[in-house]
């Protein structure tokens, strides 16, 4: 989980300001699958790439969100970008961190955890990353992973690196991250829960 979200975010971040505006306008009229609602216009037009990714995944979940994003990109004439997005969402995930049992490949696809649902917003808005790392060290993160995250220069890049490990995490690993977030930045968790 999180791979499709990454791919959506990468695609949207590669759009120019004008292209992103055009993407949002097309999103307001693109045909939707039955049972899916439309992101409200007022909220949509003011979003940056991070917020829009978060909203796409919360409204449409990862698989359909990526498909919808690719459809809009194609409609804009950005066939290559749409192809890259779809290719990226079909790649396999990495190995599990030490001490964490990866789910068997035959397992049913688990539901979307808060951590996955709000990945983009967490990357953008978490400030107390060092505290999170200390809380997760030895439980979820190996020493190598811990050092790799700490080596990143900014909070968003630290969080992006941290999220590069989450596809291999199980539900309880994600819960430990969420617990740490609730303890260090409760207002952020509460705000995202309301969104």
């Amino acid at each position: 989980m999180g791979r499709a979200r990454d791919a959506i975010l990468d695609a949207l971040e590669n759009l120019t300001a004008e292209e992103l505006k055009k993407f949002k306008l097309k999103l307001l009229s693109v045909p939707l699958r039955e049972g899916y609602g439309r992101i409200p216009r007022g909220a949509l037009l003011s979003m940056d790439a991070l917020d829009l990714t978060d909203k796409l995944v919360s409204f449409y979940l990862e698989t359909y969100g990526a498909e919808l994003t690719a459809n809009v990109l194609r409609d804009m004439g950005l066939q290559e970008m749409a192809g890259q997005l779809q290719a990226a969402t079909h790649q396999g995930s990495g190995a599990a961190p030490a001490g964490i049992q990866a789910p068997p490949q035959s397992a049913a696809k688990p539901g979307l955890h808060f951590i996955d649902q709000h990945r983009a917003a967490l990357i953008a808005r978490v400030t107390n990353v060092e505290w999170l790392l200390d809380a997760l060290y030895g439980k979820v993160l190996t020493d190598e992973q811990y050092q790799a995250v700490r080596a990143e220069p900014t909070n968003p890049s630290k969080m992006r690196k941290l999220f590069s490990f989450t596809p291999a995490w199980n539900w309880t690993c994600k819960d430990l991250l969420l617990q740490a977030l609730r303890e260090s930045q409760s207002y952020l968790v509460e705000d995202l829960e309301r969104s």
């Epitope: 049992q101 049913a108 539901g111 955890h113 690993c173 994600k174 617990q179 609730r182």
Partner: antibody
Framework: EVQLVQSGAEVKKPGESLKISCKIS????????IHWVHQMPGKGLEWMGY????????MYNEKFQGQVTISADKSISTAYLQWSSLKASDTAMYYC???????????????WGQGTLVTVSS | EIVLTQSPATLSLSPGERATLSCHAS??????LSWYQQKPGQAPRLLIY???NLHTGIPARFSGSGSGTDFTLTISSLEPEDFAVYYC?????????FGQGTKLEIK
């Protein structure tokens, strides 16, 4: 309608093994955590841990870690709590419970089984 | 482990009166607190979650408030069926913990 139906009362001797169950219906079993809560006679509630059937990962209260095992069988939408060697102090009511919603891990228990009374006595 | 302390241990009131139950957390739990009602021989029932949200199907006479370390469950006008044991539970961190309970009895 969400339903959690637990197995019947058990009377066991110290040292015996036991596995109690919680059969779930009314929602997708793999999308929600199932928790176990312990209540000794005339006492308060104590959270033991949970299983997330989607990936079979479990979280335990350290007090119960190594004392019990929480598991699930996706094919029959059933969660289990088991002991390999019961003690007299394990005598209690055991409830399975499902949160209001799991994605944010705010574990407010909106749905409960009827409870399984376990009595351990020589 | 976060310890929740409920007070009073027992509260004796009459139907129609207002009941105020307290729950104190040993450390800051923000708004991650819920309240349950339990009657003899029954499983607990969720009343309030996230400090002040009323669970579906729960009468409006129940309300919750508080944040940080101090929380209150209020029953505005007691009905005969409200006499039971009430527990608070924190969802801030593991292990999840419950208070020891407040027994609400008929005076």
């Amino acid at each position: 309608e969400v339903q959690l139906v637990q197995s019947g009362a058990e009377v066991k001797k110290p040292g015996e093994s036991l596995k109690i169950s919680c059969k779930i219906s009314g929602y997708s079993f793999t999308d929600q955590t199932i928790h176990w809560v312990h209540q000794m006679p005339g006492k308060g509630l104590e959270w033991m841990g949970y299983i997330y059937p989607g990936d079979s990962s479990a979280m335990y209260n350290e007090k119960f870690q190594g004392q019990v095992t929480i598991s699930a069988d996706k094919s029959i939408s059933t969660a289990y709590l088991q002991w390999s060697s019961l003690k007299a102090s394990d005598t209690a009511m055991y409830y399975c419970a499902r949160p209001l919603y799991s994605y944010a891990s705010y574990y407010w228990f909106a749905y409960w089984g009827q409870g399984t009374l376990v009595t351990v006595s020589s | 482990e976060i310890v929740l302390t409920q007070s009073p241990a027992t509260l004796s009131l009459s139907p129609g009166e207002r009941a105020t139950l307290s729950c104190h957390a040993s450390q800051n739990i923000n708004v991650w607190l819920s309240w349950y009602q339990q009657k003899p021989g029954q499983a607990p029932r969720l009343l309030i979650y996230k400090s002040s949200n009323l669970h579906t199907g729960i009468p409006a006479r129940f309300s919750g408030s508080g944040s940080g370390t101090d929380f209150t469950l209020t029953i505005s006008s007691l009905e005969p069926e409200d006499f039971a044991v009430y527990y608070c539970q924190q969802g801030q961190s593991y292990p999840l913990t419950f208070g020891q309970g407040t027994k609400l009895e008929i005076k």
